[in-house]
């Protein structure tokens, strides 16, 4: 996988006027890395792993850049003509990548109320937009505004591309994203499901990178997909990930079942614990689209694009 730096900024408007704050999250190699929110942007490292490696200068620089980007995005939202009553959002996602062969890619995407309406390849400066008429109207509106804005010149887009890559290279050089491997902790629990049945849940947590195989086996043979329920692989806030898989089995047959885990070339199997059945209230609760972002997203049901 390539190394990547991803900026995700969102601004909101209510009843025709743009709100003063903005939300931003920066992901480094797919992991939450920095965060800014509300009125005052203060770039905060996401998890000890980032804080330990990078100094205050980084946060100051990113805070300055993100604040500038947030201001630009608010101005863009103010120029969108079809704003109706109620709450609206404009989201900009900017990504740059460095591949193994040292080739680079950069792109920028705009979403209005959670719907993609405009994308740009920052290297070729080529714009693309979806087919829907609403999206095209929005896209033309925003494109024209960006072109009119003296800041949004050819050099500006080149600078966005170059700056993103410069930051990414700086982070890579710092060693914050060494291609490290953190093995998961695997934990198997059981809970009463219904008469004569139990639900067994296998949780893997604290692993990096995010790719993992987690499945239930009966007598050493993988259960079919339709008899298992998987949780999403989610960041746990420490630069690592967590996930789970569950299945329902007959009580008394626990010895036949094992949880199989494979991660970064290593594997393990984990039996179902015997003894007293533990009653668990629920599986991990998570919101796939929100990833623990600001409450405002949850309250307003604004979709967060990953």
């Amino acid at each position: 996988e390539p190394h990547s730096l991803r900026y995700n900024l969102t601004v909101l408007s209510g009843d025709g006027s743009v709100q003063s704050g903005f939300l931003a999250e920066v992901h480094l190699d797919g992991q939450p890395f920095l965060r800014c929110d509300r009125q005052k942007c203060r770039a905060k490292p996401q998890g000890q792993w980032a804080e330990d490696v990078l100094g205050n200068k980084t946060w100051d620089r990113e805070t300055r850049d993100l604040t500038g980007n947030g201001k630009d995005l608010r101005m863009t939202l103010a120029h969108i003509k079809d704003q109706k009553e109620g709450l609206h959002s404009l989201q900009e996602i900017r990504v740059c990548e460095i591949h193994e062969d040292n080739s680079t890619r950069s792109s920028q995407h705009f979403y209005y109320d959670g719907e993609l309406f405009l994308s740009q390849n920052l290297e070729t400066e080529e714009w693309t937009m979806p087919q829907s008429s609403r999206a095209q109207t929005l896209a033309m509106n925003v494109r024209n505004f960006l072109k009119e804005d003296a800041m949004k010149t050819k050099t500006h887009y080149h600078a966005m591309h170059a700056d993103c890559l410069q930051e990414l290279r700086r982070y890579l050089k710092s060693g914050v994203v060494l291609r490290r491997t953190v093995p998961p902790m695997v934990n198997v629990t059981r809970s009463e499901a219904s008469e004569g049945n139990i639900t067994v849940t296998c949780r893997a947590s604290g692993f990096y990178p995010w790719n993992i195989t987690l499945s239930w086996r009966q007598d050493g043979v993988s259960l079919s997909h339709d008899t298992q329920q998987w949780g999403d692989v989610l960041p746990d806030g420490n630069g690592t990930y967590q996930t789970w898989v569950a299945t329902r089995i007959c009580q008394g047959e626990e010895q036949r079942f094992t949880c199989y885990m494979e991660h970064s070339g290593n594997h393990s199997t984990h039996p179902v614990p015997s003894g007293k059945v533990l009653v668990l209230q629920s599986h991990w609760q998570h919101h796939h689209h929100h990833h623990g972002l600001n409450d405002i997203f949850e309250a307003q049901k604004i979709e967060w694009h990953e």
Epitope: R217, D219, G220, V221, R256, T258, Y260, H267, T269, P271
Partner: antibody, heavy 118, light 107 residues
Framework: QVQLQQSGPELVKPGASVKVSCKAS????????IYWVKQSHGKSLEWIGY????????VYNQKFKGKATLTVDKSSSTAYMHLNSLTSEDSAVYYC???????????WGQGTLVTVSA | DIQMTQTTSSLSASLGDRVTISCRAS??????LNWYQQKPDGTVKLLIY???RLHSGVPSRFSGSGSGTDYSLTISNLEQEDIATYFC?????????FGSGTKLEIK
């Protein structure tokens, strides 16, 4: 390719014990269970039990509990079946098998003939 | 224990014939039925798993079908190398149990 190489034939006296080995190659040994099956002369097959090489967990056919003990040596990718208190009823060909994770008894060893005779 | 019954203990057929071997379980085994081939030298190979799934490398002339308690293995075009004993086996309930085998011979 997956291979299971079993130890050679054994001639043992009644009351004695025997240890049959099954050396696995061509795959990650601790990834898949090893199963053991008995075939008495001219008869059908009987499942003895299986072992998870990763953690040593075993499941036995009730009929063979106390007769067979399954173990593994991860360092040499070898599974063992120890048979004790042998009688003529234990004379048979014993097979080890493994799985590909999708089907039982996917790959089989060549079999080990155990003869119990005074 | 679940009893697996292969009523035909031996079967004679000519090369090129279509041959069907049947197997019955004493109770519903939910399609957890596998077929194995044992050559005269004792070598055992998996042919079919989960009633009808062909194991990799097994010729397509072999097929399996069935449900509930009744299952069958079909060889569509018998070849010399198919001379062997065929066993069915259920994997639904412990202990795993095998049929008594059907020995296939050439007429």
């Amino acid at each position: 390719q997956v291979q299971l190489q079993q130890s050679g034939p054994e001639l043992v006296k009644p009351g004695a014990s025997v240890k049959v080995s099954c050396k696995a190659s061509g795959y990650a040994f601790t990834k898949y269970n090893i199963y053991w099956v008995k075939q008495s002369h001219g008869k059908s097959l009987e499942w003895i039990g299986y072992i998870d090489p990763y953690n040593g967990g075993t499941v036995y056919n009730q009929k063979f509990k106390g007769k067979a003990t399954l173990t593994v040596d991860k360092s040499s990718s070898t599974a063992y079946m120890h048979l004790n208190s042998l009688t003529s009823e234990d004379s048979a060909v014993y097979y080890c098998a493994t799985t590909d994770g999708y089907s039982l008894f996917t790959y089989w060893g060549q079999g080990t003939l155990v003869t119990v005779s005074a | 224990d679940i009893q697996m019954t292969q009523t035909t203990s031996s079967l004679s057929a000519s090369l090129g014939d279509r041959v069907t071997i049947s197997c019955r379980a004493s109770q519903d085994i939910s399609n957890y039925l596998n077929w194995y081939q044992q050559k005269p030298d004792g070598t055992v190979k998996l042919l079919i798993y989960y009633t009808s799934r062909l194991h990799s490398g097994v010729p397509s002339r072999f097929s399996g079908s069935g449900s509930g308690t009744d299952y069958s293995l079909t060889i569509s075009n018998l070849e010399q190398e198919d001379i062997a004993t065929y066993f069915c086996q259920q994997g639904n309930t412990l202990p795993f149990t095998f049929g008594s085998g059907t020995k296939l011979e050439i007429k």
